[in-house]
């Protein structure tokens, strides 16, 4: 297991225990309980108090990271007396051995890369392992393909994201024969880590007075519909003086993605490219391939 648990309790103990796999804190049920409460306090003195489970002898923490160390606390009142117990959950191991600079990104709608760096005080034989649990905590994903640097795991590639949900818990454990290695954990929203592909099927059709650009929204990992997208069009006249500003047009996502603009014949050679973003985050994709229209002698 990744950490030592130390109990601070009065004489008659509630036998408080914490399961880091399920994030479930439980204790011995007391007869004639009138009041129960559980919470944790982190190193920044933030308090998290989850809803109690139905049987009132356990509670489940959903959105928490543990690598900075936390203290769990349970208060129980019965008709006879009150109980109180603390459970320290430190991140044991040598300081500075945990994986650092951890980040993940989803790309191509169904692939994910996570990367990290070895801790500055980690010994040469350190090995890191990545585990991912979705917010429903139904299953744990172990990294299937590690990225290595001199034999040490410093990244992970996943080509099956079916086990993920909108918010996921990432845990990087470490092992060494020499010393204890601290763990690192993080909660990540898939919507914040997805990098969109550029829009597809970009076409330009022109008549004598106008040009109509059409495109399809990119395929994404998240369940997004047309209103969730924002697009930027770069309509660019070819062979212009360097430093001439491109025309960047913002277009909201629609059922039929199109942009109609005046452009009369004869028209000079132009190019258009499009990029996409989540309308709420504006994390822009790369540009689509430039499509050319018009003629050199326009």
């Amino acid at each position: 297991e990744k950490s030592d648990l130390r109990t601070v309790a009065p004489a008659s103990s509630l036998n408080v225990r914490f399961d880091s796999r399920t994030m479930n804190l439980s204790w011995d049920c007391q007869e004639n309980t009138t009041f129960s409460k559980c919470f944790l306090t982190d190193k920044k003195n933030r308090v998290v108090e989850p809803r109690l489970s139905n049987n009132e002898c356990s509670c489940t923490f959903r959105e928490i990271c543990l690598h900075e160390g936390v203290t769990f606390e349970v208060h129980v009142n019965t008709s006879q007396r009150g109980f109180q117990q603390k459970l320290l959950y430190p991140n044991s191991g040598r300081e500075g051995t945990a994986a650092q600079n951890f980040s993940c990104f989803i790309y191509n709608a169904d692939l994910m890369n996570c990367t990290w760096a070895r801790g500055p005080t980690a010994p040469r034989d350190v090995q890191y392992f990545l585990y991912i649990r979705n917010s429903k905590r139904r299953r744990e994903i172990r990294c299937p393909y590690y990225i290595q640097d001199s034999g040490t795991h410093v990244g992970c590639h996943l080509d099956n994201l079916s086990g993920l949900t909108s918010r996921n818990y990432f845990l990087v454990n470490g092992t060494s024969r020499e010393i204890g290695i601290q763990f690192f954990d993080s909660l990540l929203d898939t919507k914040k880590i997805e990098r969109f592909n550029p829009p597809s099927n970009v076409t330009v059709r022109c008549n004598t007075t106008h040009c109509l650009v059409r495109w399809k929204q990119p395929r994404t990992y998240q369940k997004l519909s047309y209103l969730d997208f924002q697009y930027q069009l770069d309509v660019h006249r070819k062979n212009t003086q360097p430093g001439t500003e491109n025309l960047l047009i913002n277009v909201s996502g629609d059922l039929e993605n199109r942009y109609n603009f005046p452009s009369s014949e004869p028209r000079a050679k132009h190019s258009v490219k499009i990029r996409a973003a989540d309308v709420r985050i504006l994390n822009w994709s790369s540009w689509s391939e430039a499509i050319e229209f018009g003629s050199d002698d326009g």
């Epitope: 909108s166 369940k223 519909s225 047309y226 209103l227 969730d228 059922l255 039929e256 709420r280």
Partner: antibody, heavy 120, light 111 residues
Framework: QVQLVQSGAEVKKPGASVKVSCKIS????????IHWVRQTPTKGFEWMGG????????VYAQRFQGRVTMTEDTSIDTAYLTLSSLRSDDTAVYYC?????????????WGKGTMVTVSS | QAVLTQPSSVSGAPGQRVTISCTGS?????????VSWYQQLPGTAPKLLIY???KRPSGVPDRFSASKSGTSASLAITGLQAEDEADYYC???????????FGGGTKVTVL
């Protein structure tokens, strides 16, 4: 131009079933998520359910579970709503809609509605 | 009983500014979920007016704007016009009820 064309008004007796259709034109149903919402003068708008791409199945509002069935025929771009064991308080206008966003559920485009009257 | 609370009616003279409030709770607007607004002209189907708290679909005039704070949201119509006379509904998602939840609607009358 994308449009949702709904079937005509229905009058049904209590205990009967009703099937409302919603034909999509100008777009392929297989690329869309259709949800159903009803409107009554007393309860206002009530979301009934629809296709959830994350679960890859049709999900139903709890209060209609067991009485409602939503189906789709992508070959003719048509969605259907069947409500059984009708009661007088099911008298409502039933709308199909195209989901514009899933978070939160946002109806981007609505059909004109189908009036269903339940009366003995 | 609607999950989201709106005033039953508001009114204003042409050219005036009117606002409609929408109050929810910690399981919906405060969860936090974005808010949408729909306009329903007499005898017609609803039309999406605002999505993701303050975004307008193409074709919706910029006289319509909206904002959200905490567990409530509001819709503002500036430069009120006769054609704005309609029912307006707020909507969002709810953690407990799941799916979409709506306000009871606000009738806007142009005096």
């Amino acid at each position: 131009q994308v449009q949702l064309v709904q079937s005509g008004a229905e009058v049904k007796k209590p205990g009967a079933s009703v099937k409302v259709s919603c034909k999509i034109s100008g777009h392929s149903l297989s690329e869309l998520s259709i949800h159903w919402v009803r409107q009554t003068p007393t309860k206002g708008f009530e979301w009934m359910g629809g296709f959830d791409p994350e679960e890859n199945e049709i999900v139903y509002a709890q209060r209609f579970q067991g009485r409602v069935t939503m189906t789709e025929d992508t070959s003719i771009d048509t969605a259907y709503l069947t409500l059984s064991s009708l009661r007088s308080d099911d008298t409502a206008v039933y709308y199909c809609s195209i989901v514009g966003s899933f978070s939160p559920l946002t109806m981007g485009l609505w059909g004109k509605g189908t009036m269903v009257t339940v009366s003995s | 009983q609607a999950v989201l609370t709106q005033p039953s009616s508001v009114s204003g003279a042409p050219g005036q500014r009117v606002t409609i409030s929408c109050t929810g709770s910690g399981s919906n607007i405060g969860a936090p979920y974005d808010v949408s607004w729909y306009q329903q002209l007499p005898g017609t189907a609803p039309k999406l007016l605002i999505y993701h708290n303050n975004k307008r679909p193409s074709g919706v005039p910029d006289r319509f704007s909206a904002s959200k704070s905490g567990t409530s949201a509001s819709l503002a119509i500036t430069g009120l016009q006769a054609e704005d006379e309609a029912d307006y509904y707020c909507a969002t998602s709810d953690e407990i009820l799941s799916g979409s939840v709506f306000g009871g609607g606000t009738k806007v009358t142009v005096l």
